[in-house]
Interface confidence: low
């Protein structure tokens, strides 16, 4: 339904508080280097303008599209050329090309300082002095570092952030109350950002059909009692929501997400029995809860799939009449019966089924040709099952840190051209699959593990896309969304790689390592491990283990020494020499 003024419509639907927060997120995700104060000023100007349109929808410029209004506002930033370089050229374009141009300049790895957490008393004082500014700053800092963060979900994080400070700044032991909550929000926030980044990559790189297929599979697993028509409606609406958010249309996205949550709750009887509690919550919590809701129980006595999709004489007729609908029904029926499969596996099975029908429906005897199609699924199902079994055994044997190290070595040998920080970040996250998923029973392991790995490998893909250095990474990232993980798994050691020159500076450590947190210290050691492999890609596990054990002992010894700096200088030289000898460098 058309509105005379889109900005007035969204302001009224969302309310002033959410409107301002979402505009701030949108601006910070586009202009990631701009100071906080500049963004607040722009947001206030947009908000004042929106209010004039609410008062009179016919007022000047109120009929303009949100992209036009927001783009015009962003293009008033005086330092656009100096700060952003060629992004300033976007401002010479007309809509919709201007918005597309801004989107293309979003930076997944912006050159911004690491967020350092101040002392608890300092944070509490800032919170009490100006709660509104404090919370806006949170939105701004997260949004500019995560330019694809799911905006309505960021509002939910901000609400929890506020709740944590409201409670803990009154507590007897503020730090004991607040710090675990902030750690939890940080970790959940990173996970949420990565999950949304995969959704946007799916839409932007592989198109709406790929996203819809993913959504059909996931929603069918989650809502197995819902009819196919109901799942299809939810998929259409969910696709619209994520297309909007990934496209920078955050006001429309938040508004449509609220409508979708409302629809789901009004129709929960025909969707899922697990939604009751979610639907009693306020909007932000409700939407979050629905997105995370557990799978409903499968209906009893579901018939065999073979009847409709293999044995029926009408398979080719049904397929020809409406290919995507028929494949959607196949995916729906398979997914609702298999909450134990990962979404990407279900999509591989659907792709295999599609390929078989394309081939067989043109054959002389179609039925004879596709009669054994389900047999083709067996190896596809067994591959992730075996891989997860092996890796969970390795994780249980090694523990998280050493399991991460094993993956670091494995992935550095596969794609040694990738930057060391990216290899460390991605391998650490890949290693977290162990503690996240291996504790689950068999029936939950695969959806947990393989769908999580899809999210992590997407991080590698988007970081690599910014500075491509490896044809193998490009190939695995671009050829097939659902086969990314099998593609990376299948990579062997890169025999074409020329080892890096040895540089002693890379392995020089100082006393500052002693004051780092355990996590930061691990990252230092893992960085050294990646560099070692880049110098000596043919080093054996045993050789690398010996060097890393020596390195750990060296750090521990020097951190206990009276004169730490001297110890690091002298013992460090010895360690480098011993490591060179051990690895034959």
């Amino acid at each position: 339904d058309a509105h005379k003024s889109e900005v007035a419509h969204r302001f009224k639907d969302l309310g002033e508080e959410n409107f301002k927060a979402l505009v701030l997120i949108a601006f910070a995700q586009y202009l990631q280097q701009c100071p906080f104060e500049d963004h607040v000023k722009l947001v206030n100007e947009v908000t004042e303008f929106a209010k004039t349109c609410v008062a009179d929808e016919s007022a000047e410029n109120c009929d303009k599209s949100l992209h036009t209004l927001f783009g015009d506002k962003l293009c008033t930033v005086a330092t656009l050329r100096e700060t952003y370089g060629e992004m300033a050229d976007c401002c010479a374009k007309q809509e919709p090309e201007r918005n597309e141009c801004f989107l293309q300049h979003k930076d997944d790895n912006p050159n911004l300082p690491r967020l350092v957490r101040p002392e608890v008393d300092v944070m509490c004082t800032a919170f009490h002095d100006n709660e509104e500014t404090f919370l806006k700053k949170y939105l701004y800092e997260i949004a500019r570092r995560h330019p694809y963060f799911y905006a309505p979900e960021l509002l939910f994080f901000a609400k929890r952030y506020k709740a944590a400070f409201t409670e803990c700044c009154q507590a007897a032991d503020k730090a004991a109350c607040l710090l675990p909550k902030l750690d939890e929000l940080r970790d959940e926030g990173k996970a949420s950002s990565a999950k949304q980044r995969l959704k946007c990559a799916s839409l932007q790189k592989f198109g709406e059909r790929a996203f819809k297929a993913w959504a059909v599979a996931r929603l069918s697993q989650r809502f197995p009692k819902a009819e196919f028509a109901e799942v299809s409606k939810l998929v259409t609406d969910l696709t619209k929501v994520h297309t909007e958010c990934c496209h920078g249309d955050l006001l429309e996205c938040a508004d449509d997400r609220a409508d979708l949550a409302k629809y789901i709750c009004e129709n929960q009887d025909s969707i899922s029995s697990k939604l009751k509690e979610c639907c009693e919550k306020p909007l932000l919590e409700k939407s979050h809860c629905i997105a995370e809701v557990e799978n409903d129980e499968m209906p009893a006595d579901l018939p065999s799939l073979a009847a409709d999709f293999v044995e029926s004489k009408d398979v080719c007729k049904n397929y020809a009449e409406a290919k995507d609908v028929f494949l959607g029904m196949f995916l729906y029926e398979y997914a609702r019966r298999h909450p134990d499969y990962s979404v990407v596996l279900l999509l591989r099975l659907a792709k295999t089924y599609e390929t078989t029908l394309e081939k067989c429906c043109a054959a002389a005897d179609p039925h004879e040709c596709y009669a054994k199609v389900f047999d083709e699924f067996k190896p596809l199902v067994e591959e992730p099952q075996n891989l997860i079994k092996q890796n969970c055994e390795l994780f249980e044997q090694l523990g998280e840190y050493k399991f991460q190290n094993a993956l670091l070595v494995r992935y550095t040998k596969k794609v040694p051209q990738v930057s060391t920080p990216t290899l460390v970040e991605v391998s650490r996250n890949l290693g977290k699959v162990g503690s996240k998923c291996c504790k689950h029973p068999e029936a939950k392991r695969m959806p947990c593990a393989e769908d999580y790995l899809s999210v992590v490998l997407n991080q590698l893909c988007v970081l690599h896309e910014k500075t491509p250095v490896s044809d193998r990474v490009t190939k695995c990232c671009t050829e097939s969304l659902v086969n990314r993980r099998p593609c990376f798994s299948a990579l062997e050691v890169d025999e074409t790689y020329v080892p890096k020159e040895f540089n002693a500076e890379t392995f020089t450590f100082h006393a500052d390592i002693c004051t780092l947190s355990e996590k930061e210290r691990q990252i230092k050691k893992q960085t050294a491990l990646v560099e070692l492999v880049k110098h000596k890609p043919k080093a054996t596990k045993e050789q690398l283990k010996a060097v890393m054990d020596d390195f750990a002992a060296f750090v521990e010894k020097c951190c206990k020494a009276d004169d730490k700096e001297t110890c690091f200088a002298e013992e460090g030289k010895k360690l480098v020499a011993a490591s060179q000898a051990a690895l034959g460098l």
């Epitope: 709740a163 409201t166 306020p282």
Partner: nanobody, 115 residues
Framework: QVQLVESGGGLVQPGGSLRLSCSAS????????MGWYRQAPGKGLELVAS???????HYADTVKGRFTISRDNSKNMVYLQMNSLEPEDTAVYYC?????????WGQGTQVTVSS
């Protein structure tokens, strides 16, 4: 460990009033929902009234205009003012508080409306 304690129940004549209170002890943060549920003999649990973090309220059709829910954020307290009580309101009334970490219930307080 969070504990909820209800008070204020009792025997009252039709047309009378009662005020139920529920207090939360222990560490509870980020509350987004406080509510009162009731269970009459031989019946299921039904939501009577709820109040969200922004103060918006929701009432069962059977109590609209007679019952009022309110909360005191600073004390983690939730109240239910019940006026014009009817025999059909006889039930055990339970307090429910939800936060980001979980869903907490009290033991219940008996309300009996009888002449």
């Amino acid at each position: 460990q969070v504990q909820l304690v209800e008070s204020g129940g009792g025997l009252v004549q039709p047309g009378g009033s009662l005020r139920l209170s529920c207090s939360a002890s222990g560490s509870i943060w980020g509350i987004y929902h406080m509510g009162w549920y009731r269970q009459a003999p031989g019946k299921g649990l039904e939501l009577v009234a709820s109040i969200t973090v922004d103060g918006s309220t929701h009432y069962a059709d059977t109590v609209k205009g007679r019952f009022t829910i309110s909360r005191d954020n600073s004390k983690n307290m939730v109240y239910l003012q019940m006026n014009s009580l009817e025999p059909e309101d006889t039930a055990v009334y339970y307090c429910d508080i939800r936060n980001v970490g979980g869903d907490y219930w009290g033991q219940g307080t008996q309300v009996t409306v009888s002449s």
